[in-house]
Interface confidence: low
């Protein structure tokens, strides 16, 4: 064999006896007829030698060390070569060592080409015998980062101040490349950063520096995990010890892109997070240890990356290709901010782009899936605009305000489905006709259904909320003067079962001047509660609303107001109420800003209640609540 090392290559080759074997016959290195058991070759030297036995690999090992000095001159960055070439070396178990020294302010990055590295613990060995031992430096102290095999997830290791990389190749291994390159980086301000890349499902076991011995005092080590968006990562601690801290606290911190509470801080004894979608970082922070009884901090943990379970494996098709002017947003329900870690909950488009919220628009067919441990953490909000621009075309036209079935089949609860109904100003008005008569939600008779319709003006300058209405009441239809939004809001998961009860038809009708008209057909045996729009804030200035209340021939209606006075104080104009019998046109007019509200009155025929507001002074608003109760007539008054 001949080994020639170029001058100033900073390479030293050492051939020495390996682990002693029980072989009876010894073996020697032979140079110029001299028999020796160790040979050192330095830069600029050329040595020819041989062995005294047929199988030197059973006796000797070879170490090739290259010192790279980044302190006094430029650093030779880039792909690291195996020098001398393995083809020129004797077939011994060989270890290539690269010792890089750099300033504390310089970061050094080892980049591993595929196959990436897999960390092994004490007592473990690599199946192919190829091992990578990596250590760093804190001042004069060497810190073992870890021992690694091939076929893993570790793609990069960043350190500063220096790095020692030892690549051990068994004598029979044909490898002739180092498999890594070195790059310079800015200071990382910590012991090291290990990047672990998952292409698909898999797991990685990783350890703190110096494991199973103690992690250096008051140091920081970070692992960066790159996880495809459609997969989920879970962290579990396999083994850890805590040292005795004098100052600070030993902890792990998670940094999750998109989280509002980064970093998420955990004690080592806490249950660690699972079900994380996408990339994340984990950092181990040591403390100032007690000088007398330091103890040791060490951590061995596993990251498991897998396809999400159950619901999350499914692909849902949301076909909005035949919809117009509609958007569907899936987003997190509002929750109280908590410092406690909550696993990510994501919705994915085409299983690739995952985010905490997603908006789908009409005109396309969308494929979505979920990355979420608990889909009740998400809800859906949908907006659809139905607009009429040409009153001649729209008049008398009807549209069904119905939640499309494919939206109901998504595994996420529908929160709001809002229809924005737009009409040409002063040309058309709207009428809402429910499939089932509606009840107005009041404190006295609250809705207890799984959903309600919230009806409000959709004119930006107008603050007018007509109320919340649910199925099972006496309101047969609601007419409104101009643009409104109707929002179907769900209150319970049982909405899925009750979805058949939803059904509201909107029709464009000739324009009328009142803000709203409620047609009420009370049922016998039940008290109908009705209240003016904008309850709690007061009917807007100069607004007029009416109730058309039907009374069957064999019944009498009792109209009751729940206050003695309206409480309104007018700044300008008058507030009044008209109660008019529809058959005789006889009417009573009450000045709401002056008069006492009428005592309970009985009506044998259908009648109108019309309330018109003045411009009230602030704080003295017009809010009225009244009820209608039917009872059988005892005497025929016709």
């Amino acid at each position: 064999f001949e080994i020639a090392l170029p001058r100033e290559s900073n390479i030293t080759v050492l051939i020495k006896l390996g682990t002693p074997t029980l072989l009876a016959k010894p073996c020697y290195i032979v140079i110029s007829k001299r028999h020796i058991t160790m040979l050192s070759i330095k830069s600029g030297e050329r040595i020819v030698f041989t062995f005294s036995c047929q199988s030197p690999e059973n006796h000797f090992v070879i170490e090739i060390q290259k010192n790279i000095d980044c302190m006094s001159g430029p650093c030779p960055f880039g792909e690291v070569q195996l020098q001398p070439s393995t083809s020129l070396l004797p077939t011994l178990n060989r270890t290539f060592i690269w010792d890089v020294k750099a300033h504390k302010s310089i970061g050094l990055e080892l980049q591993f080409s595929i196959p990436r590295l897999r960390q092994i613990g004490p007592g473990e060995s690599c199946p192919d015998g190829v091992t990578h031992s990596i250590s760093g430096r804190i001042d004069a102290t060497v810190v073992r980062i870890g021992t690694f095999c091939s076929n893993g997830t570790v793609s990069r290791i960043k350190m500063q101040e220096g790095v020692k990389m030892a690549l051990h190749l068994p004598w029979f291994h044909p490898r002739n490349v180092s498999g890594f390159s070195i790059a310079n980086r800015s200071s990382i301000k910590r012991l090291c950063i290990i990047e672990s890349v998952f292409e698909g499902e898999g797991s990685a076991t990783l350890m703190s520096a110096n494991y199973p011995e103690g992690f250096p005092e008051d140091e920081l080590m970070t692992w960066q995990f790159v996880v495809p968006a459609h997969l989920r990562a879970s962290v579990s601690f396999l083994n850890f010890n805590l040292s005795n801290c004098e100052r600070k606290e030993e902890r792990v911190e998670y940094y999750i892109p998109g989280s509002t509470t980064n970093p998420e801080v955990f004690k080592l004894e806490d249950k660690q997070p699972g079900n994380m979608a996408g990339n994340f970082n984990l950092s181990l922070q040591g403390c100032d240890q007690d000088a007398q009884s330091p103890g040791i901090l060490r951590l061995q943990f596993q990251v498991l990356v897998q396809h999400p379970q159950n619901e999350s494996n499914k692909i849902y098709v949301v076909d909005l290709s035949n919809e117009r002017a509609m958007s569907l947003t899936i987003e997190p329900r509002p929750v109280k901010q908590s410092r406690k870690f909550v696993p990510g909950c994501f919705v994915c488009l085409e299983s690739r782009t995952c985010s905490s919220n997603l908006t789908l628009t009409s005109g396309s067919k969308h494929k979505i899936s979920f990355l979420c441990d608990d889909l009740t953490r998400l809800w859906m909000n949908v907006e659809k605009t139905i607009s009429c621009t040409d009153h001649r075309y729209c008049q008398r036209k009807s549209y069904s305000l119905q939640v499309p079935s494919d939206i109901l089949h998504l595994p996420v609860e529908l929160h709001d489905f809002s229809w924005k109904l737009l009409v040409p100003k002063d040309r058309l008005s709207l009428v809402l006709v429910p499939a089932q008569k509606l009840q107005q939600h009041t404190h006295e008779k609250p809705c207890n259904t799984s959903f309600s319709y919230l009806v409000a003006s959709a004119i930006p300058s107008q603050d007018l909320y007509f109320g919340s209405f649910c199925p099972g009441g006496s309101i047969k239809q609601i007419q409104v003067k101009q643009n409104i939004s109707v929002t179907l809001r769900t209150f319970a998961p049982s909405f899925q079962q009750e979805a058949s009860r939803q059904g509201l038809t909107v029709s464009f009708i000739p324009y009328f001047k009142e803000e709203g008209v409620f047609t009420v057909t009370p049922d016998t045996k039940s008290k109908v509660y009705l209240r003016t729009p904008n309850w709690d804030r007061g009917l807007p200035s100069l607004t007029s609303v009416s109730w058309n209340i039907s009374v069957p021939r064999d019944q009498v209606a009792c109209l009751t107001f729940f206050k003695e006075r309206s409480g309104v104080v007018c700044q300008t104009g008058r507030a009044f109420m008209i109660i008019q019998e529809q058959r005789t046109r006889a009417e009573e007019i009450f000045s709401l800003d002056e008069d006492v509200l009428p005592k309970p009155s009985f009506h044998h025929h259908s009648f109108w209640v019309n309330i018109s507001n003045c411009s009230p002074t602030s704080g003295k608003q017009l809010d009225l609540l009244f009820s209608v109760t039917l009872t059988p007539r005892t005497v025929d008054l016709t």
């Epitope: 499914k314 692909i315 098709v317 076909d319 035949n322 067919k365 494929k367 009807s398 549209y399 069904s400 119905q402 499309p404 079935s405 494919d406 109901l408 089949h409 499939a435 979805a499 058949s500 059904g503 038809t505």
Partner: antibody, heavy 119, light 107 residues
Framework: QVQLVQSGSELKKPGASVKVSCKAS????????MHWVRQAPGQGLEWMGW????????TYADDFKGRFVFSLDTSVSTAYLQISSLKAEDTAVYYC????????????WGQGTLVTVSS | EIVLTQSPATLSLSPGERATLSCRAS??????LHWYQQKPGQAPRLLIK???QSISGIPARFSGSGPGSDFTLTISSVEPEDFAVYYC?????????FGQGTKLEIK
């Protein structure tokens, strides 16, 4: 051109099972949903349900839950309808039809398979 | 579920006459209604989709109206090959349903 070709007529005894196949050609099976429709002799059409050809998830109309199973073999572009514990009232022509997911109009139909259940 | 009621059950016309077939839904189903023609011993054939949209290859004499809850299929001038049973179908919500059919027969 698009074709749905169904298996031939079947005569079965009550209590037996039958499996009707529907082979799709001229398009990619997984691009459209597959629906099953029943027509009893001299009667109208009854929608039985559908199978999502992308995920294999079936949806059954209430009257067809239990004894009816929709399945797929995408490798041979074929959808199947299996009926177990056959009854005389299952005697009908069964059609497969191609539809749009969640909003189906059935633009192509199989020729129908007559299943007769008689002792 | 949406119940579709077709009328009349039978319509007797001579070739060249105008046919008007009605389909009424138990509630408003917007334009989620399709029409099919079925001849004896044959599978149904799609005629009209989404209440009024025409289908490629279907003669122009077939037209539909909607949306809402009342739908009409019109054959402007009946040809001999049009005598068949016509079904409307709701695609509004599960379960998808068919009307009971209208038989168009030769007078």
């Amino acid at each position: 051109q698009v074709q749905l070709v169904q298996s031939g007529s079947e005569l079965k005894k009550p209590g037996a099972s039958v499996k009707v196949s529907c082979k799709a050609s001229g398009y990619t099976l997984t691009d459209f949903s597959m629906h099953w429709v029943r027509q009893a002799p001299g009667q109208g059409l009854e929608w039985m349900g559908w199978i999502n050809t992308e995920t294999g998830a079936p949806t059954y109309a209430d009257d067809f839950k239990g004894r009816f199973v929709f399945s797929l073999d995408t490798s041979v572009s074929t959808a199947y309808l299996q009926i177990s514990s056959l009854k005389a009232e299952d005697t009908a022509v069964y059609y497969c039809s191609r539809g749009r997911d969640y909003d189906p109009h059935f633009d192509y139909w199989g020729q129908g398979t007559l299943v007769t259940v008689s002792s | 579920e949406i119940v579709l009621t077709q009328s009349p059950a039978t319509l007797s016309l001579s070739p060249g006459e105008r046919a008007t077939l009605s389909c009424r839904a138990s509630q408003s189903i917007s334009d989620f209604l399709h029409w099919y023609q079925q001849k004896p011993g044959q599978a149904p054939r799609l005629l009209i989709k989404y209440a009024s949209q025409s289908i490629s290859g279907i003669p122009a004499r077939f037209s539909g109206s909607g949306p809402g809850s009342d739908f009409t299929l019109t054959i402007s001038s009946v040809e001999p090959e049009d005598f068949a049973v016509y079904y409307c179908q709701s695609a509004h919500s599960f379960p998808y349903t068919f009307g009971q059919g209208t038989k168009l027969e030769i007078k």
